[in-house]
Structures are given as structure tokens and as C-alpha cells.
Interface confidence: medium
């Protein structure tokens, strides 16, 4: 079935950046790292410097949810995080802007930010029982939960 | 530690402009955007606007555009807020104010600093 | 802009006691509200962001709730060092208008 967003009419109005250069350590403590130009994975670093730093831009909706909808962009680049689909890698997608608005089939581009205490969960708004989440020996991914890894430590002005 | 440390008191003559400093330390200073609210006597809090300190961009409130300018000094930490066309009503206590995006709250304020007063009178 | 009407504008209670203080939005803020408090000469300090977070540091006698256009400020048990206004403040849209404060005073 056509995931949830494709079939509203929901429209995201870019807000502004809220965080920058931050990095995402998952709850084995591993940080997301580049793989390779086009996927993510994580690794337990001894060195920060190694770790991708996130800036994360928040967006509003049409429809004045309560939810906090969200972007993620490799900081000092212009790839953004973008949803596939369930246990698909995550791909860093090139655009030369942030968007101003994404609707529709644009949503991959979006996450809705959870937080319970320290604990941070980024939702995919066009799949939204999917999280980014990290996987034994394999890249950043879309999952629903276990196995995966779907709970990250947001670590801020490592710089 | 935060801190904010801001110029010192003012006074001013109507139709004169006034430019408010705002040190910052403690913290990195181009992470968190910094917002300027003013505090007439006896009066609640009138949030002016902001700068994003990582892109030097401004963002003003509608009653002050076009009299207010926000400027940056990023190798001093420092953020300036210059009013001009001053009038009595200008009078008021001048804060700046970290931004911080506390989960669910656009535009929270945690650190803010001591104020500066500006007094206009002819 | 979105108002913010508090209540009461003062209010004066004794060392002990619990005090609630109202703030109402003009529109829904989807929980937005963030509550600060000023003691007389110094600067605001926040307290609670996303209606009921506390800022960490801050004493656990405070407290905040609501949703949609209505939202409370708990001190439930008043101590001295709580003299103060305090403000309400809207996260939602800008220009991110403020209460026009509560003045608490010891009985």
C-alpha cells in the first residue's frame, strides 16, 4: 500500500535550522560515520572527529500537528538524509538547497524527532512505523524495532 | 558557564540611535542564535527578533523592522543591537537572550543577559 | 500575533502554599509554551519549555500542564526565594509573544 503521506495532502514549510554539527551516537554508543558517498553506518569511535555531523533543520505542517517534523543534512554539505524503504539503507541525497516546502512523495526527505529522556527517535513521515535505526554489519536503515537499533544520543558542540 | 555580559546603561535624545553589545562566553557561540527583548518600565517582556549566529542572518519583529539591526562579531563572541529613530517609548531595559531549541519549544531563551537601560529623553 | 493573556496579574500567597497561575492563547500552540520567572532588577531565567519540561537545575516544586489554548504554572509549595513575575511565553509562531506577567507576593 502507498505509505501514509503520498496519500494526504500534507504540505512542510521549511522553519529554520535548530541544531548544528551534532553527532548521533546509537545506544551501543557507536556513531554514524560515512560509509561511502552514498550510505551510512555506525562504528564505536575512539576519536569524534570521525563521527558525521548532523545539522538538523525543523519544518512545520499544514494540518498543525503537534509532531516535530524534521530534515537532516551531513553538516557543510548539501546531502540530506532521504528514507527508502523498510531495512533499505537510508541514502545522503544531494540537492542544492534546503527545501522550502516538501509534500508528497518529497516526505522521504522528512522525519518526525521523538524524544523520551536522553533518548532521540527520528520516524520516517512517508513511512511512518519506521525508524532510522543502525543494524549489526550493515548501513543506517530504515526499521520497525528490534533487531535494529532505533534509539540515538544526540551529541551536541563537539567541534 | 554561560554568560552574557552587556553594555552599560545609556541615555539617549530622541531621533539618536543607541548600539547595545552582548558578550558572550561559556559556550560555543555560533551553535545557539541570539535573541534581543526589550522591557519597557513596569512593563512585560516585547521579543525584538533574532540572529542566527552560524549564518549572520536576521530575523525581525514586525513592530521594529526598519529601525532595528542585529550584527555579529564572531571572533569576540559578540552581539550587537543598534535602535534607531529613538523615541521616549524606546525606553526600556534591553536584553539579549541565547536561543535554544528545547525539544517542542521554538525560541526558548536560557541564558540571558543582565539587560541594558536605555533611557530617551530630550 | 498570537496573545497571551495571564492570570491573575498579582497574586499574593503565604510560604507553603500551592499556587497556580493561568496563561491563554488567543490560538492553539500545540503545547509551545515555555514559563519564566523575574525577580525584581534581574534578567528572566526560564523555567519550562514544551509546557511541562523542566529546564534542568530547576526545582522539582514547579511544575506546568494544558494543551490547545489553555496552560497552568504549579509552585506547589511557595518559598520565599519563589518572589517573583513570572511570564508565559508562546514557541509557536512568530513574533513568540510573551504573558504580560503575574507578580507573586508573600503574604
Known amino acids: 500500500s502507498a505509505p501514509f503521506s503520498f496519500l494526504s495532502n500534507v504540505k512542510y514549510n521549511f522553519m529554520r535550522i535548530i541544531k548544528y554539527e551534532f553527532i548521533l551516537n546509537d545506544a551501543l554508543n557507536q556513531s554514524i560515520i560515512r560509509a561511502n558517498d552514498q550510505y551510512l553506518t555506525a562504528a564505536a569511535l575512539h576519536n569524534l572527529d570521525e563521527a558525521v555531523k548532523f545539522d538538523m533543520g525543523a519544518y512545520k505542517s499544514s494540518k498543525d500537528d503537534a509532531k516535530i517534523t524534521v530534515i537532516l543534512r551531513i553538516s557543510k554539505t548539501q546531502l540530506y538524509v532521504t528514507a527508502q524503504d523498510e531495512d533499505q539503507p537510508v541514502l545522503l541525497k544531494e540537492m542544492p538547497e534546503i527545501p522550502k516546502t516538501i509534500t508528497g512523495s518529497e516526505t522521504n526527505l522528512l522525519f518526525f524527532w521523538e524524544t523520551h529522556g536522553t533518548k532521540n527517535y527520528f520516524t520516517s513521515v512517508a513511512h511512518p512505523n519506521l525508524f532510522i535505526a543502525t543494524k549489526q554489519d550493515y548501513w543506517v536503515c530504515l526499521a520497525g524495532g528490534p533487531p535494529s537499533i532505533t534509539d540515538f544520543q544526540i551529541l551536541e558542540n563537539q567541534a | 558557564e554561560v554568560q552574557l555580559v552587556q553594555s552599560g546603561a545609556e541615555v539617549k535624545k530622541p531621533g539618536a540611535s543607541v548600539k547595545v553589545s552582548c558578550k558572550a562566553s561559556g559556550y560555543t557561540f555560533k551553535y545557539y542564535g541570539m535573541n534581543w527583548v526589550r522591557q519597557a518600565p513596569g512593563q512585560g517582556l516585547e521579543r525584538m527578533g533574532w540572529?542566527?549566529?552560524?549564518?549572520?542572518?536576521?530575523t525581525y519583529a514586525d513592530d521594529f523592522k526598519g529601525r532595528v539591526t542585529f550584527t555579529l562579531d564572531t571572533s569576540t563572541s559578540t552581539a550587537y543591537m543598534e535602535l534607531s529613530s529613538l523615541r521616549s517609548e524606546d525606553t526600556a531595559v534591553y536584553y539579549c537572550?541565547?536561543?535554544?531549541?528545547?525539544?517542542?519549544?521554538?525560541?526558548?531563551?536560557?541564558?540571558w543577559g543582565q539587560g541594558t537601560t536605555v533611557t530617551v529623553s530630550s | 500575533d498570537i496573545q497571551m493573556t495571564q492570570s491573575p496579574s498579582s497574586l499574593s500567597a503565604s510560604v507553603g502554599d500551592r499556587v497556580t497561575i493561568t496563561c491563554r492563547a488567543s490560538?492553539?500552540?500545540?503545547?509551545?509554551l515555555n514559563w519564566y520567572q523575574q525577580k525584581p532588577g534581574k534578567a528572566p531565567k526560564l523555567l519550562i519549555y514544551y509546557t511541562s519540561r523542566l529546564k534542568p537545575g530547576v526545582p522539582s516544586r514547579f511544575s506546568g500542564s494544558g494543551s490547545g489554548t489553555d496552560y497552568t504554572f504549579t509552585i506547589s509549595s511557595l518559598q520565599p526565594e519563589d518572589i517573583a513575575t513570572y511570564f508565559c511565553?508562546?514557541?509557536?509562531?512568530?513574533?513568540?509573544?510573551f504573558g504580560q506577567g503575574t507578580k507573586l507576593e508573600i503574604k
Open positions: 540572529i542566527n549566529t552560524y549564518t549572520g542572518q536576521s
Open positions: 511565553q508562546q514557541g509557536k509562531t512568530a513574533p513568540y509573544t
Open positions: 537572550a541565547r536561543d535554544i531549541y528545547y525539544y517542542g519549544s521554538d525560541f526558548a531563551m536560557d541564558y
Open positions: 490560538q492553539d500552540i500545540s503545547n509551545m
